[in-house]
């Protein structure tokens, strides 16, 4: 009764198609699969960035898999063949592992790469990234930004750089069609006549770095003798009302400061008839229903009421 064995997949490799971190893992079927002609072979693939504690694991019937990686670090992957018991008339059989690694040979010392990279997707419309030059690099150093997301045929270079002293220190992106809710990959590399410049890689999702415009049309309405309703409108632009959270700052008679976070474009405030002045400002942020993270907008213009009984009029800025 001979033990059934199966070989690991052949020609296991990680291929870089030039998408700045989105890599292809591919392989060929194991040798000597003839014994298992009626079998559907499966593969268990494990992969991670070098230095990561945990492996990502998938099982597939395919000969390829694609995923995103941090190219600032190396990548390691391993794969083996799986035979379900139906293939062997007995128990599960798995091969030994085939292993492979991939990394981009780093040029230049780490200090030469861009510092303080910051990207903001203004009002879910305009992406702007800015950075500072590497430490100790000379003025002849210039940086170039490339980006890619699923839907683009190839990585594109920034065409509208922000400059300071002749150096590129940022990029204004063009309209990015169908670019949210997917990984957005950026590489900033550089060139200098004096020394090699280290490349930097970044990955994020655009909906998570949105900074909306502030709310507009702030108004007061007296609801009752002891209640005032504060209202405002969502800022102009593509962000739907369901995607906003708001923070309100209310000042009563220059002393009391109330802050509150709400999901709707209204807030009811308890007041007394003695209130002589009421001011409030609002700011907005994309909420958890539409993103995993976000940036608060600037505060709106201040809206104030003072002096006159609020029951007699509604104030509209």
């Amino acid at each position: 009764d001979t033990e059934i064995k199966v070989n690991p997949p052949q020609d296991f490799e990680i291929v870089d198609p030039g998408y700045l971190g989105y890599l292809y893992l591919q392989w060929q079927p194991p040798l000597s699969l003839d014994h298992f002609k009626e079998c559907t072979v499966e593969y268990e693939l494990k992969y991670r960035n070098i230095g990561s504690e945990t492996w990502k694991t998938i099982i597939t019937k395919n000969l390829h898999y694609k995923d995103g990686f941090d190219l600032n670090k190396g990548i390691e992957a391993k794969i083996h063949t799986l035979l379900p018991w139906q293939c062997t008339n007995g128990s599960e059989v798995q091969s030994s592992w085939a292993e492979t690694t991939y990394w981009i040979s780093p040029q230049g010392i780490p200090e030469t790469k861009v510092q303080d990279m910051d990207c903001v997707y203004y009002n879910w419309q305009y992406l702007l990234c800015s950075w500072k030059p590497g430490i100790g690099v000379l003025l002849d150093t210039n940086y170039n930004l490339f980006y890619w997301y699923e839907g683009l045929d190839h990585a594109l270079q920034c065409v509208d750089y922000i400059k300071a002293d002749g150096q590129n220190i940022g990029c204004r992106f063009p309209y990015l069609e169908a670019s949210d809710y997917k990984d957005f990959y950026i590489c900033v590399n550089g060139s200098s006549e004096n020394k090699p410049i280290r490349s930097s890689y970044f990955t994020f999702q655009l909906q998570n770095i949105v900074k909306p415009l502030p709310p507009v049309y702030l108004t007061f309405t007296r609801e009752s003798s002891c209640e005032i309703k504060l209202k405002w409108s969502i800022p102009l632009g593509p962000i739907p009302a369901r995607c906003f959270d708001y923070e309100i700052e209310i000042r009563e008679d220059d002393t009391t400061l109330v802050t509150a976070t709400v999901e709707n474009e209204t807030y009811t405030l308890k007041t007394t008839n003695e209130t002589r002045q009421l001011c409030f400002v609002v700011r907005s942020k994309v909420n958890i229903y539409c993103s995993d993270d976000g940036i608060w907008s600037e505060w709106s213009d201040k809206q104030c009421w003072e002096g006159e009984d609020l029951s007699k009029k509604t104030l509209l800025r």
């Epitope: 099982i59 597939t60 379900p84 018991w85 599960e92």
Partner: antibody
Framework: EVQLLESGGGLVQPGGSLRLSCAAS????????LNWVRQAPGKGLEWVSA????????FYADSVKGRFTISRDNSKNTLYLQMNSLRAEDTAVYYC??????WGAGAFDYWGQGTLVTVSS | DIQMTQSPSTLSASVGDRVTITCRAS??????LAWYQQKPGKAPKLLIY???SLESGVPSRFSGSGSGTEFTLTISSLQPDDFATYYC??????????FGQGTKVEIK
């Protein structure tokens, strides 16, 4: 005749724990991969977790990773799902399902009748 | 993750009608697709596996076709017992295993 019978459901507070069991009969238990699939009230099917026949390989949906643990006792023909740090969104009928062919998951040819887990304060 | 999209969400039909439900995968899944029928308060029941193979005991009026990203479940002549919700499911690559959102077949 293949039979899968879930138990262990009930009402639990958010943050609480529960252990579901699935007693199996009618097939060679230690060979087949088994899965948990859940269905929130009025919603569709959502895959939760899978375990290979030997128990050596386990897989989880992102929504439960780190909170739920799948295991099996091949001597008792029983599948388990240990659920910790329960949330309101875990409220669902939980089904155990047998894989027709495959290492960890695949087409599910037999299902239990389900057990209801309600997470509420 | 592989997304599965079913259409329509609801389908009104009469006994004897030919009914077709479509399932689309966000990427190629070869033929690794199953179809299930579920009735209220009951567990799902496997109808079709490997895109077109009829599960044992399932009436021959049910058939599946397609490969790659486009799949269909056809009921050649709808019977009273067939009014239910139908789900497709991919098992090409996991985790996660993913299901379509379901198609409810109701009486016209």
């Amino acid at each position: 005749e293949v039979q899968l019978l879930e138990s262990g459901g009930g009402l639990v507070q958010p943050g609480g724990s529960l252990r579901l069991s699935c007693a199996a009969s009618g097939f060679t238990f230690s060979r087949d991969a088994l899965n948990w699939v859940r269905q929130a009230p009025g919603k569709g099917l959502e895959w939760v977790s899978a375990i290979s026949g030997s128990g050596g390989s386990t897989f989880y949906a992102d929504s439960v990773k780190g909170r739920f643990t799948i295991s099996r006792d091949n001597s008792k023909n029983t599948l388990y799902l240990q659920m910790n740090s329960l949330r309101a969104e875990d409220t669902a009928v939980y089904y155990c399902a047998k894989v027709r062919y495959g290492w960890g998951a695949g087409a599910f040819d037999y299902w239990g009748q389900g057990t209801l887990v309600t997470v509420s304060s | 993750d592989i997304q599965m999209t079913q259409s329509p969400s609801t389908l009104s039909a009469s006994v004897g009608d030919r009914v077709t439900i479509t399932c689309r995968a966000s990427q190629s899944i070869s033929s690794w697709l199953a179809w299930y029928q579920q009735k209220p308060g009951k567990a799902p029941k496997l109808l079709i596996y490997d895109a077109s193979s009829l599960e044992s005991g399932v009436p021959s009026r049910f058939s599946g076709s397609g490969s790659g990203t486009e799949f269909t479940l056809t009921i050649s002549s709808l019977q009273p017992d067939d009014f239910a919700t139908y789900y497709c499911q991919q098992y090409d690559t996991y985790p996660p295993i993913t299901f379509g959102q379901g198609t409810k077949v109701e009486i016209k």
